[in-house]
Interface confidence: low
């Protein structure tokens, strides 16, 4: 019966939506009006009132109804007078919602639309800090970045001020993220003040002023390790060959190296003249795979290059006269040992392959058993799932969700009307071929507490807080380990390049460039992402959606964060925060049923709520037409 009611609501909503222009809430022909107190954009967590006043010819409304994202609200509605009603929300936490109201008129079979409005909640911006400007050699640009602070959830813009200290000339730029300023436009000498204003509908903040000298912020052209050779001597030594195209005369460099099995880097420092290829000697253990990276800075200056691509070299077991090897660069600009999962073999020995194979067989068997149990016993499957997840290796369920057999996906594929063609937020891209996963750190300048011999663990060393970004746009998606992260845009360092081989060429990134609340220590990953707004399916019927996912989440219970696996699939590149307590908003892809569980799973997370895109009503319009059929 409950399902029938919900579907009947949907049919009513369908009729209402048919009576609108096809352009979302801003184009509604209203028969009355709807307004929000205190405002349509308000601080997250506030109590708000939504008022609806009917002005329909020949209609004294029997009842006034409110809908949020296409779902009828049933509580906290007060009738104020014959034509007006109020809907009250306590502690409203959704970043975006589309509201509309309808009237039940006598002698009318269906509800009549009164009006609609998009509402948004969020926070005023923090004071931008850690303003950093660098010039990557040969780039022709000064790249300025800053720490935007906490998530605002609403459109936040930044005005970057660049003022010459010599001519007093000031230029201002509007951006949503970082900024590249052509050095040709910096004609007011060498010394500048740079500061950033952050502004949104809820407030405005201004950073401290950063004083820069153009000669002091140049980062030399990237240093690259080209090859390695091990020479048989009394004590075998390994020579690493490396070079840079820099024209800067005085350059200081660091090379760090470690056995791939180690967590600790050793660091060697060099004063370098790049008129010829550099050779650095190392005395290494035999028969061990080592990884090397190099980075440089103009001597005495502030900013370092990002670390170069990981360069691998395995020392020979019994040393021949000369062993020369130009080992592959598994990734670019990485601070971590690479997990390179290719369509071919993993770069590990045979024992690793056998382990992987065994794990996959065990997983397949368990999955079959689970599926059978899931079909026959709904209550049993939820209980056993958690215990199984504790037993199986984390990598088996961690980062690669598969929607191939999901009924939701099948339903969506069969009914393409569900997808809103002009909606960038709702793109269905099912089952891409995952060829590899790469984890990459994007470091910036040398920390002040940096030691010559770095003995700290890999994860906590050498990765300063501010990363410098460039023009590549990437999209955030939720991450399994941190529980949840919304979608946003972000940018990669100028000095960083995708690998020369064809590994990553299939990634054409064209998301919007308009939103960024950048976090610290980003790691670049290629991830699957199922970027369909689940909240818009959810409103159809609890049975329709949650029933399909009942193996993963029983309606009345909460499960571990891997519930997201079944909700995301699209090959995407993303930057992701290390810290679980940092989330980066712009678009949530989870329905509230899931979200309530995530809060329990990770207590450090701030309150997380479903994001409803501005054009959600249009997707409801499309989706509900399916019911009519």
């Amino acid at each position: 019966m409950n399902q029938v009611t919900i579907q009947w609501d949907a049919v009513i909503a369908l009729y209402i939506l048919f009576s609108w222009c096809h352009g979302g809430i801003t184009n509604i022909n209203c028969s009355g009006h709807i307004w929000v107190e205190p405002a349509t954009i308000f601080k997250m967590g506030m109590n708000i009132s939504i008022y609806c006043q009917a002005a329909i010819k020949n209609c004294q409304p029997r009842k006034l109804h409110f809908y949020k994202n296409g779902i009828k609200e049933r509580f906290q509605i007060t009738r104020i007078n014959k034509t007006t009603a109020r809907l009250w929300y306590k502690n409203f936490l959704e970043p975006h919602a589309s509201m509309y109201c309808t009237a039940e008129c006598p002698k009318h079979f269906q509800e009549t639309l009164i009006c609609g409005k998009d509402i948004s909640s969020g926070y005023p911006p923090d004071i931008p800090d850690e303003v950093t400007c660098v010039i990557y050699e040969y780039s022709g640009n000064m790249t300025c970045t800053w720490n935007a602070g906490k998530l605002t959830y609403i459109d936040t813009k930044y005005v970057v001020h660049v003022k010459s200290l010599e001519t007093e000339e000031e230029q201002q730029y509007l951006t949503s993220s970082y900024i590249n300023i052509s050095t040709d436009s910096l004609q007011g000498g060498k010394k500048y003040l740079v500061w950033v204003q952050a502004a949104n509908a809820l407030g405005m903040e201004e950073s401290k002023q950063l004083q820069i000298h153009l000669d002091d912020i140049v980062i030399p052209s990237a240093a690259v390790i080209s090859r390695a050779e091990t020479i048989n001597a009394t004590v075998p030594k390994t020579i690493i060959y490396w070079d840079s195209q820099t024209t800067i005369e005085k350059v200081s460099c660091e090379m760090r190296y470690k056995a791939t099995t180690n967590q600790t880097w050793n660091v060697k420092e060099f004063d370098t003249n790049f008129t010829y290829v550099q050779q650095s000697e190392f005395y290494l253990e035999p028969n061990i795979k080592y990884v090397f990276q190099v980075r440089c800075q103009e001597t005495g200056k502030r900013y370092w290059q990002p670390w170069s691509s990981l360069f691998f070299h395995k020392t020979p077991e019994t040393v021949p006269q000369v062993t020369s090897k130009a080992f592959q660069h598994d990734t670019w600009n990485s601070g971590l040992t690479v997990a390179s999962i290719s369509t071919g073999h993993l770069t590990s020995d045979n024992r690793g392959d056998i382990g992987l194979l065994l794990g996959m067989i065990v997983f397949a068997v368990m999955l079959s058993i689970l599926s059978l149990i899931g079909i026959f016993n709904r209550s049993f499957r939820t209980g056993i799932k958690r215990r199984i997840l504790l037993l199986i290796p984390k990598w088996l369920y961690e980062d690669i969700p598969n929607m191939k057999n999901s009924n939701v996906v099948k339903m969506l594929q069969e009914n393409s009307e569900l997808m809103n063609n002009n909606s960038s937020e709702q793109v269905l891209y099912v089952d891409p071929m995952i060829t590899e996963i790469k984890e990459i750190f994007i470091p910036e300048h040398k920390p002040t507490d940096y030691k010559k011999e770095n003995t700290g663990p890999l994860e906590t060393r050498d990765y300063p807080q501010n990363s410098l970004f460039d023009n590549t746009t990437v999209v955030y998606i939720p991450d399994l380990n941190t529980g949840y992260k919304p979608q946003i845009s972000n940018f990669l360092p100028e000095g960083s390049h995708l690998s020369n081989n064809n590994e990553i060429t299939s990634l054409t990134l064209k998301p919007p460039v308009d939103s960024l609340d950048s976090g610290n220590n980003p790691r670049l990953q290629k991830h699957p992402n199922f970027a369909f707004s689940v909240s818009s399916v959810n409103s159809l019927s609890n049975t329709i959606f949650l029933g399909e996912l009942s193996l993963i989440l029983n309606q009345g219970e909460c499960s571990s964060p891997d519930i997201q696996n079944s909700v995301e699939e699209e090959t995407t590149m993303l930057l992701e925060n290390d810290s679980p307590s940092e989330t980066i908003p712009e678009q949530t892809l989870l329905p509230d049923e899931f979200v309530s569980c995530l809060g329990i799973v990770n207590e450090e997370l701030p309150s997380i709520n479903t994001y409803f895109p501005q054009n959600i009503l249009e997707s409801h319009f499309n989706r509900i037409s399916l019911l009519e059929k």
Epitope: E170, L174, S176, A199
Partner: antibody
Framework: QVQLVQSGAEVKKPGSSVKVSCKAS????????ISWVRQAPGQGLEWMGG????????NYAQKFQGRVTITADESTSTAYMELSSLRSEDTAVYYC?????????????????????WGQGTLVTVSS | EIVLTQSPATLSLSPGERATLSCRAS??????LAWYQQKPGQAPRLLIY???NRATGIPARFSGSGSGTDFTLTISSLEPEDFAVYYC?????????FGQGTKVEIK
């Protein structure tokens, strides 16, 4: 099509204040700088100050500092210029002008402080 | 503040003739200079910005040149509607300043 519509003519007494409004339509109001320029009868153009509506960042010519206040209301896409302690030499046509559009360079907008859209002008007469 | 001096104050020419207007800055303004046209009873109209870029919808007969302190607006062949007052404006430094104007009148 972008339009800037200014409030009507004003006659003021010396020592009083005047507040002129400028309502923008047909474009994104908050992303462009709005400036106020005045022109005394038979004279040239004089820049008084400007504001970036999204940030509220305002800049004033030294000559008017302390006497002029420029504000913007994003919700109504309206900019305001208030001039206080009026004197007879403040009699002029006051124009609001919007920053040059098409200033998008990659991800950002450069604030040009050249003006490609102007209001129709508001004549403020200061007379005792 | 930067003072912009326009010359001549008045230019008397016939339709079809070439008009050359000059604007000199008291200190370098790089290429941050614009030209406007104003007709009686109307608001100014942007012609050229950043010394030499024509604004949208401005005919090709209008061109700008110069950098540093000396700038020129050239109207290659005067049309009847080109007779007006022309102002230069710099945005290199606060405050923004305008020249005093050059009136182009029909001879």
């Amino acid at each position: 099509q972008v339009q800037l519509v200014q409030s009507g003519a004003e006659v003021k007494k010396p020592g009083s204040s005047v507040k002129v409004s400028c309502k923008a339509s047909g474009g994104t109001f908050d992303s462009y700088a709005i400036s106020w320029v005045r022109q005394a009868p038979g004279q040239g153009l004089e820049w008084m100050g400007g504001i970036i509506p999204i940030s509220g960042y305002a800049n004033y010519a030294q000559k008017f500092q302390g006497r002029v206040t420029i504000t913007a209301d994003e919700s109504t896409s309206t900019a305001y210029m208030e001039l206080s302690s009026l004197r007879s030499e403040d009699t002029a046509v006051y124009y609001c002008a919007r920053d040059l559009s098409g200033g998008y360079l990659g991800l950002r907008t450069l604030y040009y402080y050249y003006f490609d859209y102007w209001g129709q002008g508001t004549l403020v007469t200061v007379s005792s | 503040e930067i003072v912009l001096t326009q010359s001549p104050a008045t230019l008397s020419l016939s339709p079809g003739e070439r008009a050359t207007l000059s604007c000199r800055a008291s200190q370098s303004v790089s290429s941050y200079l614009a030209w406007y046209q104003q007709k009686p009873g109307q608001a100014p109209r942007l012609l050229i910005y950043d010394a030499s870029n024509r604004a949208t919808g401005i005919p090709a007969r209008f061109s700008g040149s110069g950098s540093g302190t000396d700038f020129t607006l050239t109207i290659s062949s005067l049309e009847p509607e080109d007779f007006a007052v022309y102002y230069c404006q710099q945005r290199s430094n606060w405050p923004l300043t305008f020249g005093q104007g050059t009136k182009v009148e029909i001879k």
